[in-house]
Amino acid sequence: LRLLDHRALVCSQPGLNCTVKNSTCLDDSWIHPRNLTPSSPKDLQIQLHFAHTQQGDLFPVAHIEWTLQTDASILYLEGAELSVLQLNTNERLCVRFEFLSKLRHHHRRWRFTFSHFVVDPDQEYEVTVHHLPKPIPDGDPNHQSKNFLVPDCEHARMKVTTPCMSSGSLWDPNITVETLEAHQLRVSFTLWNESTHYQILLTSFPHMENHSCFEHMHHIPAPRPEEFHQRSNVTLTLRNLKGCCRHQVQIQPFFSSCLNDCLRHSATVSCPEMPDTPEPIPDYMPLW
């Protein structure tokens, strides 16, 4: 978790002088509780936006927006703590809005936004906005949280972001797999425009079962420049096992930008359709 272009973070708006600060996610109002604390945020919204860095890279960011409740507690509102928790790693990043002037009621509802938390493809986050100071022990909570899932690199709009392109999202191998005679599979895919090797991972399964009955790995050497964007054809020999008929072919590239952590593409061949009631084979052949 990180912030995008850390230098230019602003939270001031007409009628409010405000500064954005790094936060340890442990505001001192936990340790030194105040008697009077503000109410919780209202209408917290988390949206996926896209932002460019100064270097021109495009990143997905969490756009956080909330409003204040129209009660007198805004007189005691000193700021807000914004926290983003990545759920699969428990990594947390916080920033603090520090109000340098007192809030006053005005004709419009106060609204705050922040769009600088960089999020990763296919990751889930819990976003929390805590009004400060935090409540006294056993006081009513004054935070709001929402969970938010970022689409993966297959998503059309995510595909062109820098983290997705770095993991090979622009490569479309257009895999085709056909079953040949004599227990063989013919795999065909389009090479990318990079002199890097590939690996074909074949996993076979019995019909309607998920434990594999055959596994095979095939190495494809780095293509020459004249072979870029051309089709590569590979014939894989299967183990002659009755019922080991569902095949998953996965192609793993080793692009320089993602090495052995590149996006993999796969295709599946289903077991051949079985007739519902097989025709009985007679023991003898009538001669008429």
Epitope: D43, Q45, I46, Q47, L48, H49, A62, H63, E124, E126, S145, K146, N147, F148, L149, V150, P151, D152, E154, H155, A156, R157, M158
Partner: nanobody, 126 residues
């Protein structure tokens, strides 16, 4: 112009099933997460279920978990809600809603919706 049109509602006996559909147009359907939200007579809006853009993630309110199934067909630009073991308390106007941004609100407190359908009425009564 974004349009969401629900269908499939009606009067059904408790314990029976119903399948709601929502036909979408006017936006790139397979870019966005979609949700079902309901409003029982005299009550507020209640989020029922949501599904991510590629069906990779689905979420359900506790009150419908195990009975309702959300699905989508991106090629047909359609969202579905299969409702089984219906109860009287499922009686409501069911709305299809589009998530306002490309992410997916994966918790139960979802309200990031920018477009709604007109709703389809489901009445569960014997």
């Amino acid at each position: 112009r974004v349009q969401l049109v629900e269908s499939g509602g009606g009067l059904v006996q408790p314990g029976r099933s119903l399948r709601l559909s929502c036909a979408a147009s006017g936006f790139t359907f397979d870019d966005y997460a979609m949700h079902w939200v309901r409003q029982a007579p005299g009550k507020g809006l209640e989020w029922v279920s949501g599904i991510s853009w590629n069906s990779g993630r689905k979420g359900y309110a506790d009150s419908v978990k195990g009975r309702f199934t959300i699905s989508r067909d991106n090629a047909k630009k359609c969202l579905y809600l299969q409702m089984n073991s219906l109860r009287a308390e499922d009686t409501a106007l069911y709305y299809c809603a589009k998530e306002s941004s490309l992410g997916y609100c994966s918790g139960g407190s979802c309200s990031n919706f920018d477009y709604w359908g007109q709703g389809t009425l489901v009445t569960v009564s014997s």
